[in-house]
């Protein structure tokens, strides 16, 4: 109860906040190691994983490795950390740190990257007391681009087997759509004949619960009625309308995993690993 705990909780709080007073920066006595953070520029499509590597030139005895994003005001926002052989996930579990077997390299991954994850990232090593110090890596830039769903005709001529698959897919989709349209027509007729039966219930989709794809699940394709002309173009989903008793129902057709066709990316969660840096930054840390 009355035991004195000293100033360490305060110091630790300062370190965890991600801003550092000048007197913490350069203590001459404490061992430290240069850090790299690569690739210098990484581009992934939304939904893919983005992975950086934070590397230490040498393994100091006691250190904390933090992963930061630079805010628009040049403040460092801590995303996740590694401390004394354990990972400390941040508030957002999409940001993951993994220590590699050599002990000096750390994979820092954003799972299912979003457009607003684009920005500047870095890692920082904090060398623990006595003489606490900070050591920052170079910055790296992440660009998350919108998913591009090209028309099959624009892709380089695929092998015959793939075009056969695509033809089968189109025929299958068409037949399913026709069936569903007939079903909808039947539903509409029934609704017209028995209007009271359709008024009571209303199913509202949650904006926070999109179609999830588990790590082992087959990729899931969704197709909405705006795509009936089979032009595989990107659609920006409209926000869900407020739930009303007389709400018109729209169906979403869900196809269980099929092989990826040239005009469509198969899975949003394919690991986008170490991209080579841009040519201007030379070979850097990335083997061919």
């Amino acid at each position: 109860m009355g035991s004195r705990r000293g100033p360490w909780p305060l110091v630790w709080a300062v370190l965890q906040l991600g801003w550092w007073p000048g007197w913490l920066l350069d203590s001459p006595d404490r061992p430290w190691s240069p850090l790299t953070f690569s690739p210098a520029q990484l581009t992934v499509q939304e939904g893919e994983n983005a992975t950086f590597t934070c590397s230490l030139a040498d393994i100091p005895d006691s250190f904390v490795l933090n992963w930061y994003r630079l805010s628009p005001r040049n403040q460092t926002d801590k995303l996740a950390a590694f401390q004394e052989d354990r990972i400390e996930p941040g508030r957002d579990r999409r940001f993951r740190v993994t220590r590699l077997p050599n002990g000096r390299d750390f994979h820092m991954s954003i799972v299912a990257a979003r457009l607003n994850d684009s920005g500047i990232y870095l890692c920082g090593a904090i060398y623990l007391p006595p003489n606490t110090q900070i050591n920052e890596s170079p910055r790296a830039e992440l660009s998350v681009t919108e998913r591009t769903l090209e028309p099959p005709t624009q892709s380089p001529s695929p092998p015959p087997r793939l075009s056969g698959q695509l033809q089968g897919l189109v025929i299958g989709v068409t037949s399913v759509l026709v069936g569903v349209l007939l079903l909808l027509l039947l539903t509409w007729v029934l609704a017209a004949v028995f209007p009271r039966a359709t008024r009571g219930a209303c199913v509202c989709g949650s904006e926070d619960e999109p179609l999830k794809e588990g790590p082992d699940a087959a990729p899931v394709f969704t197709l909405d009625y705006g795509e009936l002309d089979f032009q595989w173009r990107e659609k920006t989903p409209e926000p869900p309308a407020p739930c009303a008793p007389e709400q018109t129902e729209y169906a979403t057709i869900v196809f269980p995993g099929r092989p990826a066709s040239p005009g469509r990316r198969a899975s949003a969660s394919s690991l986008q690993g170490a991209q080579p840096p841009s040519p201007e930054d030379g070979p850097g840390l990335w083997p061919p």
């Epitope: 790299t36 040498d58 000096r104 170079p138 201007e280």
Partner: antibody, heavy 115, light 108 residues
């Protein structure tokens, strides 16, 4: 194309001073740690000084501590090495190089310390 | 201060395998870089992070690092591989980059 070009090498008397410069181009200079490395005639490579990204941290080889100062000007894409109290054994070709990893090096500039 | 030990010279027959060593106390905990230097030229990075090759470096060059020894292997050495080879690490306790003394490789 990535290029590092050293300049400032010269013949200087013992006890004199010299300032070496290294102009970087073809890459984002501010995003890389930098080294000065030297090589005496017919000898091996010897690391001289290191500066990290942002210029906050510097490190020096034992033989040059207190005499040499490394610095960088990211606005000018230039790395510097200020050499004071020069000695005969500082005679060498001085290279600037990106550090960790040392994937690009300049062609070097010759510093000769002799009376 | 931290010391890296390299044999002063090594010889390999054309198209045979050369193994160059770099010894240091617990070097396995450190990230090793290897450089090739030919007369009158600056050094060229051939291995970084123990075993990674920068783009443009032939596949015959490979690296490994564990315990107290780092190794550079040249599989099927060519005449153009005749050069001096240096290993380098960062020593966090002395806060210094350290080079080995270098190994002069001769290809017969």
């Amino acid at each position: 194309e990535v290029q590092l070009v050293e300049s400032g090498g010269d013949l200087v008397k013992p006890g004199g001073s010299l300032r070496l410069s290294c102009l970087a181009s073809g890459f984002t200079f501010s995003n890389f740690h930098m080294n000065w490395v030297r090589q005496a005639p017919g000898k091996g490579l010897q690391w001289v000084a290191f500066v990290n990204v942002g210029g906050i941290r510097t490190a020096y080889a034992d033989g040059v501590k207190g005499r040499f100062t490394i610095s960088r000007d990211d606005a000018k894409n230039t790395l510097y090495l200020q050499m004071d109290s020069l000695r005969a054994d500082d005679t060498a070709v001085y290279y600037c190089a990106r550090a960790f990893p040392g994937d690009y090096w300049g062609q070097g500039t010759l510093v000769t310390v002799s009376s | 201060s931290y010391v890296l030990s390299q044999p002063p010279s090594a010889t390999v027959t054309l198209r045979q395998t050369a193994r160059l060593t770099c010894g240091g106390d617990s070097i396995g905990r450190k990230s090793v870089e290897w450089y090739q230097q030919k007369p009158g030229q600056p050094p060229v990075l051939i291995i970084f992070g123990d075993s990674s090759r920068p783009s443009g470096i032939p596949e015959r060059f490979s690296g490994a690092n564990s315990g107290n020894t780092a190794t550079l292997t040249i599989s099927g050495a060519l005449a153009e591989d005749e050069a001096d080879y240096y290993c380098q690490v960062w020593d966090s306790s002395t806060k210094a980059w350290v080079f080995g003394e270098g190994t002069q490789l001769t290809v017969l």
